[in-house]
């Protein structure tokens, strides 16, 4: 169970002190992925690190991906795991550390010179070969948006929302991800009743735009749970 996974790591990350002046908040820490994890202001080995439960890659850090901690383990028990370094095996882009992506089941460097064409080809092939994701689609990837020279326009292939131009987000379309418009007031949105349920969407909608939230449309309150319509409404 998830509890047993979590309880096997007793030391909890401590919050950083808030007493310091705003101009002296401390220094950045970095760690070699897969070796050390930062905890508060000190390093902790993975043995002492409290794994974070997750439903999708986006809930993990940029140097992590979301998966079951045991091979062939309970699919319902997922935690954030350290990303895979270059030349390590992978099943989707998110498993590879920043600056790398998953090609033919191996994490390879995202060389800027041939990155764009190759990654689009890889996105396509990732969904139709033996190295496709466990559930049939790719989620967040840690590829840096700096590798794209220009922000993607509507319909452009993307890996994460920061690859898309302002007013667009990166959302699934069939088994790829493309830049789609962020939802405006009154537009139908998807409210996920349970964590990770958006994994089932083939045509994923963007989130609601700034100042809006996805709520039940007022005249649909009486409808049955399954047919309730959600729209983007002002806070």
């Amino acid at each position: 169970t998830l509890n047993s996974v979590l309880n096997s790591n007793a030391i909890k990350n401590l919050p950083p002190p808030l007493g310091g002046a705003a101009g002296h908040p401390g220094s950045a820490v970095s760690a070699a992925p897969g070796i050390l994890y930062p905890g508060g202001n000190k390093y902790q080995t993975i043995d002492n690190y409290q794994p974070y439960p997750c439903a999708e890659d986006e809930e993990c850090g940029t140097d992590e991906y979301c998966a079951s901690p045991t091979r062939g383990g309970d699919a319902g028990v997922q935690i954030c795991l350290a990303c895979r370094k270059r030349r390590k095996r992978c099943m989707r882009h998110a498993m590879c550390c920043p600056g790398n992506y998953c090609k033919n089941g191996i994490c390879v460097s995202s060389d800027q010179n041939h990155f764009r064409g190759e990654i689009e080809e890889t996105i396509t092939e990732s969904f139709g070969n033996d190295h496709s994701t466990l559930d049939g689609y790719s989620r967040r990837t840690t590829l840096s948006s700096k590798m794209y020279h220009t922000k993607g326009q509507e319909g452009s292939v993307c890996l994460r929302s920061s690859d898309c131009a302002s007013g667009l987000c990166c959302a699934r379309h069939f088994w790829s991800k493309i830049c789609k418009p962020v939802l405006k007031e009154g537009q139908v949105c998807t409210k996920h009743r349970r964590k990770g349920s958006h994994g089932l969407e083939i045509f994923q909608r963007c989130y609601c735009g700034e100042g809006l939230s996805c709520r039940i449309q007022k005249d649909h309150h009486q409808a049955s749970n399954s047919s309730r319509l959600h729209t983007c409404q002002r806070h």
């Epitope: 919050p15 908040p25 401390g26 508060g40 940029t62 992590e64 994460r160």
Partner: nanobody
Framework: EVQLVESEGGLVQAGGSLNLSCTAS????????VGWFRQAPGKEREFVTG????????YYADSVKGRFTISRDNAKNTAYLQMNSLKPEDTAVYYC??????????????????WGQGTQVTVSS
């Protein structure tokens, strides 16, 4: 290196609303956690709300749950704090802060490395 600039706060009546923004310069924003802190006169700075690098996870202190909403737009390098149903006890200097989001943990437990200069929010009764 990330530099954060908060929008102007202001004076608002109890029950009113205010929207703060926090704009970052530097390419690290889209892979950083963002938090909003506040410090009332004579009190310690407290963590109000946070959002992870992707926007998939948010956290709210009990005192602001249901009234405040945090969001972010990585394409604009900006985070937002929408404050509704404001109370006099929300009066404080509000700080936007950011830190690397390399490894997931509770949003209140990150090391917030970069800080804005703070903006005054006053709620009158």
């Amino acid at each position: 290196e990330v530099q954060l600039v908060e929008s102007e706060g202001g004076l608002v009546q109890a029950g009113g609303s205010l929207n703060l923004s926090c704009t970052a310069s530097g390419s690290a924003f889209s892979s950083s956690v963002v938090g909003w802190f506040r410090q009332a006169p004579g009190k310690e700075r407290e963590f109000v709300t946070g959002i992870n690098w992707s926007g998939a996870r948010t956290y709210y202190a009990d005192s602001v749950k249901g009234r405040f909403t945090i969001s972010r737009d990585n394409a604009k390098n900006t985070a937002y704090l929408q404050m509704n149903s404001l109370k006099p006890e929300d009066t404080a200097v509000y700080y936007c802060a950011s830190g690397r989001d390399r490894y997931a943990r509770e949003l209140s437990e990150y090391e917030y490395v970069w800080w804005g200069q703070g903006t005054q929010v006053t709620v009158s009764s």
